[in-house]
Amino acid sequence: GWVWNQFFVPEEMNTTSHHVGRLRSDLDNGNNSFQYKLLGAGAGSTFIIDERTGDIYAIEKLDREERSLYILRAQVIDITTGRAVEPESEFVIKVSDINDNEPKFLDEPYEAIVPEMSPEGTLVIQVTASDADDPSSGNNARLLYSLLQGQPYFSVEPTTGVIRISSKMDRELQDEYWVIIQAKDMIGQPGALSGTTSVLIKLSDVNDNKPIFKESLYRLTVSESAPTGTSIGTIMAYDNDIGENAEMDYSIEEDDSQTFDIITNHETQEGIVILKKKVNFEHQNHYGIRAKVKNHHVDEQLMKYHTEASTTFIKIQVEDVDEPPLFLLPYYIFEIFEETPQGSFVGVVSATDPDNRKSPIRYSITRSKVFNIDDNGTITTTNSLDREISAWYNLSITATEKYNIEQISSIPVYVQVLNINDHAPEFSQYYESYVCENAGSGQVIQTISAVDRDESIEEHHFYFNLSVEDTNSSSFTIIDNQDNTAVILTNRTGFNLQEEPIFYISILIADNGIPSLTSTNTLTIHVCDCDDSGSTQTCQYQELMLSMGFKTE
């Protein structure tokens, strides 16, 4: 049978020929009658065999990390017979390891993020080195990790490569650290090979700083003319944290007047002081308010850093604005009777300068020929007023400061012209009537009505009468209907077109005013030739008849 021990060849041997071992048949008596042959991968190129002795040699430098074993086949032949002495056999040559590979960190670059203020022992990252040497061969691939740079903040577990925090760190002092880790094989013994890697450790922010006002006092100004909602200035606190942890909210802590508000601009992290109520320099020319600032997000476990909010004092000066005159009333209504003489008193308006200097006021009326105003605000008439022409006047009164004529205010003044009974009633229209020659007594000739241009206090009431002359000699009579109308009737039978073609009747109309006014109104009555049915045949004025719808032949 075959006789051999397990074959090993050390890697990286520089000799041209390295004896690996010997394989032989136990039938070989050493008389050189056997021939040994080597077959398979590496036979003849990597390994050779002494055909006579069966000694195997490595003729090539081997690298265990490239290939750690070779499976070859061996034959032994009796030279005298040419026959195989032993059955062909397979054997293994193993390449034994030497420590020729340093540890390598294959996952570089390493980067880790850990919250600032993390307690000692907090795991940061694990780094792992690989050693291509044989882990089963002594300590060639047994690694020990150590820290070359990073004390006293970090430590590394020697056998695992786990990096831990060994001292609390404040991101606001330093936000990143370069740690250098060394891996040594041979568990650090003499002759060990080493490799290093760098780890960038970044500290993430925790909310361990509250926002603080750098200024203990802010001075702001606001114009008294500023509308509500006006931004009058900004205040700013600073927070050493970053991102969400630096987001802050401003608020008013003290403002007895409740005149101001503070809103937060979350983009710039500024506090904007806003006017909540209008200010008046003459009423109060300065204010003092206290503002505070707090973080927007605070975790429960970090509340200890945020116990007392930072505050600041804000002094706000109100700027005086030269304001226009202020009328006592927003508008005025005055009354005056018509027909009062020029220069009559209408009313008084009053405006004052709201500013401290109390400028005298001048008054004027915009585009009026009927009224005048003096420097005391007294309005008088420049003409007699006729209510029947205009019953109301809408005036625009302007008040101007004497010391600053650009400061102007205007208000409306309404003047009502009151009625007096200065118009008598009169016919509501022009009346022209006719009567047939053959008309009988008591026949209705015309219904008349009247109008009065005066304003009726309660209700107009008109009284109709014939003049004294017409009453005595009239062929006609009048009946007052008591409803502001009257009817004219014939007072005889028969009329003569030839003798008296036209009658002019004077009618008196009186009103119920105090004193009562009366007018005389003339009614014209034409005499016409009529047929038996009363249809008009001929009147003196043909065109009149036509206009009244009468036929003429």
């Epitope: 077959l39 991968a41 690298d63 490239e66 290939r67 750690s68």
Partner: antibody
Amino acid sequence: QVQLQESGPGLVKPSQTLSLTCTVSGGSISSGGYYWSWIRQHPGKGLEWIGYIYYRGRTYYNPSLKSRVTISVDTSKNQFSLKLSSVTAADTAVYYCARVYSNYGWFDPWGQGTLVTVSS
Amino acid sequence: EIVLTQSPGTLSLSPGERATLSCRASQSVSSSYLAWYQQKPGQAPRLLIYGASTRATGIPDRFSGSGSGTDFTLTISRLEPEDFAVYYCQQYGSSPSFGQGTKVEIK
């Protein structure tokens, strides 16, 4: 897991040099215990081993192609390359790259292959 | 150089049947150095068996390998539709080489 991807021109003129690159992803070409190999397959035919390389640069070639073949490695790019000179139409084939387990010699995994045609 | 000869060149079988593929080496090959591959049209070969009998990761147990010396066998116990392909053996005993392939086609 390791993946391989061949790249290079699909058409080469006769007498010129065929050049292909294999990019390794999902693992390091510098890992011990592996060879990085090229294999080709003529249209409708079987597989022919061309050669392989260890990341430290040692090469092994098919004796029948040895005079024309060069395999090189670029560990910084995790790539290895094939150059086949003086090509003829007989070199038209699908070229594969693959990883070889050095102790026992099996090929796994393989790239998807790239067809190279030699024609004027 | 070791030459691998596969037989038969083509195997016509129906799904569910057993397939037996042979690979013969021109000289003895260590079983550790013998592997089998499957190749489907338009795809790269895929490792099935290494060390003559060990299934690669993800290979169904209907595939098995055996043999030693110069004679090796790949057996597919029960053919599935996806098993119809070309199969190659490969040795590493000297310079790597492949057999010419056996095509397993649907009958």
